[in-house]
């Protein structure tokens, strides 16, 4: 998906009313200095890729995040404000039922929502470059 | 099952307000927005506005911008939308309809309509 | 806004017809277009969504297909309670909108 069009205003809004609140939650009792961010990204759409395939797409040490409270927000922002995100997610929402939930909060999963939290305000921080 | 109950039917004179209630159940209110349209007499369907509980925020149709107004209240499972401002044209029935924004992505399920009359 | 234009107005047929609807959108839409039937005195109700996905409880003579700017609903053969207008809306991008209608009458 190409988020060139996006509303990064509106995304923005939410992340700083409600999503960025959801992810710390997550990560307490670690410290910002537990992790080094590895991932990063160069401007809004390329962002909101990086930060789509972090919470979204599962990994061998951290299987899904996306049944998580910051994930379903951050779904739910996207296909708002993206123009025509909503119907790429038909297909991987069947997909995503059928996986079983296996909810344990690993150390890979904190460094993955660390890395989360990074390009999230990287996001912020490319958005005031560009006002 | 998902219900959709909305308040009743309202007659109101011009210049007043109107709050139109949409009382949800049988699903998880958080997991779907609540979109507001609207239908004049003999017309189409005209898409007001959505507040996403989730999310806990709102957008309006700009034709409705600082006229309409969209809450919900999370304890209850019940939305809002409220009109000021009212002139004859916004006689019409309203509907409120659910709409996943995690999945399904369409305007599934839809209240059985609140009709009202502006009228002096 | 994204503007949908529906044809055509009225279509009168017989049951047992096929009838076929048009919804053409003013910019190219992948296919975020879904379709209701609203009968007088009722809500719409949800017939196909994302163009050609059926629901379930909707019987299988009522079709979707298309994408980019053109869409159709197909009927394959028209029953007495299939006498409706009917509605495309996309949810492409906010504001989400509506077409502008077709009644389908008994000829």
């Known amino acids: 998906y190409d988020f060139t069009n996006c509303d990064f205003q509106k995304i923005e809004a939410d992340y700083l009313r409600t999503i960025s609140k959801d992810l710390i939650t997550y990560m307490s009792g670690t410290k910002s200095t537990d992790f080094n961010n590895t991932v990063s990204c160069s401007n809004r759409p390329h962002c909101l890729t990086e930060i789509q395939s972090l919470t979204f797409n599962p990994t061998p040490r951290c299987a899904s995040l996306a049944k998580e409270m910051f994930a379903r927000k951050t779904k739910a922002t996207l296909a708002l404000w993206c123009p025509g995100y909503s119907e790429t997610q038909i297909n991987a929402t069947q997909a995503m039922k059928k996986r079983r939930k296996r909810k344990v909060t690993t150390n890979k999963c904190l460094e993955q929502v660390s890395q989360l939290l990074g390009l999230w305000r990287r996001f912020i921080r490319t958005l005031l470059k560009k006002q | 099952q998902v219900q959709l109950v909305q308040s009743g039917d309202e007659v109101k004179k011009p210049g007043s307000s109107v709050k139109v209630s949409c009382k949800a159940s049988?699903?998880?209110?958080?997991?779907?927005?609540m979109h507001w349209v609207r239908q004049r007499p003999g017309q189409g369907l005209e898409w007001m506005g959505t507040f996403i509980p989730l999310l806990d925020t709102s957008d309006y149709n700009q034709n409705f911008k600082g006229r309409a107004t969209i809450t919900a209240d999370k304890s209850t499972s019940t939305a809002y939308m409220e009109l000021s401002s009212l002139r004859s044209e916004d006689t019409a029935v309203y509907y409120c309809?659910?709409?996943?924004?995690?999945?399904?992505?369409?305007?599934?399920?839809w209240g059985q309509g609140t009709s009202v009359t502006v009228s002096s | 806004e994204i503007v949908l234009t529906q044809s055509p107005g009225t279509l009168s047929l017989s049951p047992g017809e096929r009838a076929t609807l048009s919804c053409r959108a003013s910019q190219p839409i992948s296919i975020s277009v879904h379709w209701y039937q609203q009968k007088p005195g009722e809500a719409p109700r949800l017939l196909i969504y994302f163009a050609s996905q059926s629901i379930s409880g909707i019987p299988d003579r009522f079709s979707g297909s298309g994408s980019g700017t053109d869409f159709t609903l197909t009927i394959s053969r028209l029953e007495s309670e299939d006498f409706a207008v009917y509605y495309c809306?996309?949810?492409?991008?906010?504001?989400?909108?509506f077409g502008t209608g077709t009644k389908v009458e008994i000829k």
């Open positions: 809306q996309q949810t492409f991008s906010l504001p989400y909108t």
């Open positions: 309809a659910r709409m996943g924004v995690t999945h399904s992505y369409v305007m599934d399920a």
């Open positions: 049988g699903y998880i209110f958080t997991d779907y927005a």
